[in-house]
Interface confidence: medium
C-alpha cells in the first residue's frame, strides 16, 4: 500500500544554470494523498533558510504529482544560490533537498550551449 505521507521530490544536489534577465520557474514536486499541504520556499543563507514571503508562487497539478512553483520574473544576478521547499503536514515539517541556481550574467553567456554541454548538463534545457 502506497504511503500517504507528503513527499518532496527534489533530487539531492540538483542544480539549474539560468540566464539573468530571463523568467524562470523553480519547481518543487509534491506528492500527497487527500489534502494539499501548505508548501513554502526558502533561500539558504549559511546554515539558515530564509523564507521567501513576497515572491510569486503557484501550483501546477498533474495526474500523479503536483508542483509548487517559485517564479522568477525575471532572474536577477543575486538569485544565485541554493533553495529548499518545505511542507507543513499534520503538524510535521517536511524539508526537501536543496536545489542550486547558477545565474549567468548576459554579458558572459555564450551564444548557446554546445551539444556536448547539453548532453552532460541537461538542466541547461531550462534556460
Amino acid at each position: 500500500k502506497e504511503s500517504c505521507d507528503v513527499q518532496l521530490y527534489i533530487k539531492r544536489q540538483s542544480e539549474h544554470s539560468i540566464l539573468a534577465g530571463d523568467p524562470f520557474e523553480l519547481e518543487c514536486p509534491v506528492k500527497y494523498c487527500a489534502n494539499r499541504p501548505h508548501v513554502t520556499w526558502c533561500k539558504l543563507n549559511g546554515t539558515t533558510c530564509v523564507k521567501l514571503e513576497d515572491r510569486q508562487t503557484s501550483w501546477k497539478e498533474e495526474k500523479n504529482i503536483s508542483f509548487f512553483i517559485l517564479h522568477f520574473e525575471p532572474v536577477l544576478p543575486n538569485d544565485n544560490g541554493s533553495y529548499r521547499c518545505s511542507a507543513n503536514f499534520q503538524s510535521n515539517l517536511i524539508e526537501s533537498h536543496s536545489t542550486t541556481l547558477y545565474v549567468t550574467d548576459v554579458k558572459s553567456a555564450s551564444e548557446r550551449p554546445s551539444k556536448d554541454e547539453m548532453a552532460s548538463r541537461p538542466w541547461l534545457l531550462y534556460r
Epitope: G21, D22, P74, N78, V106, R112, P113, L125, Y126
Partner: antibody, heavy 117, light 111 residues
Amino acid sequence: QVQLQQPGAELVKPGASVKLSCKASGYTFTSYWMHWVKQRPGQGLEWIGMIHPNSGSTNYNEKFKSKATLTVDKSSSTAYMQLSSLTSEDSAVYYCARKRGGLGDYWGQGTSVTVSS
Amino acid sequence: DIVLTQSPASLAVSLGQRATISCRASKSVSTSGYSYMHWYQQKPGQPPKLLIYLASNLESGVPARFSGSGSGTDFTLNIHPVEEEDAATYYCQHSRELPYTFGGGTKLEIK
C-alpha cells in the same frame, strides 16, 4: 546560423482568427524562450508575450491575454501565435524573436496581418 | 507596468555629428548593479536590431560609434560620428520585470 521564418502576410476577415507561425532553425529550439511583438503601421513596438518551448510555460502581457494564445510544436521547431476575434486594431506586423536574457537577439522578418472584409 | 518615455520623438543630425537619444523609465530598471535597459535600431520594412544590452554593452557586430549609458530611470543612446546608414528609428526596451515594454521610438534623420 540562427533563423526564424515567418510567412510574409495574412489577410483575414473581422471576427475571424488567425494562427501565425515562426519556424526556428540553427539552434536548439527547446533551450530558449520565444517572444512575440506587435507593431502597428507607423507605430512603436508592443510586447505580447513569450513561451518556453521545452515546458510550454507562457507569460503574457495582460493587454493581450484574451487576444493571443502562444503554443509550440517541438517536433517541427515551430512557435505559433493564435489571434482571435480580429478587428482593425489587430492589423499590424507581428514579429517572433528568440529570447536571450530579456532581449530579442534574433528576430523573424515579421508577418503582416491585415483585417479587412 | 513600467512606462518608457523617449525623447526627442525625432531629430535631424548632420553627418559626422553626435546624436543623443534619451529614455526615461517610470521606475528604476536597475538592481544588483545591473541596468535592464536595451536599445534597438529599426529601419523601414525590417525587424528591430539589438544595438546595446544592459544599458552600456555593445552587441556583437555593432559599430563602436554606438554607445549607451545610464542607470536607475535615466538612459542615453549616443551615436558619434553619425553616418548615413544610421537613419532609422531607435527604441529602448526594459527587461526588469514583466511585462517588458518599449519606448515610443525616436526617428533619426541625417542632414
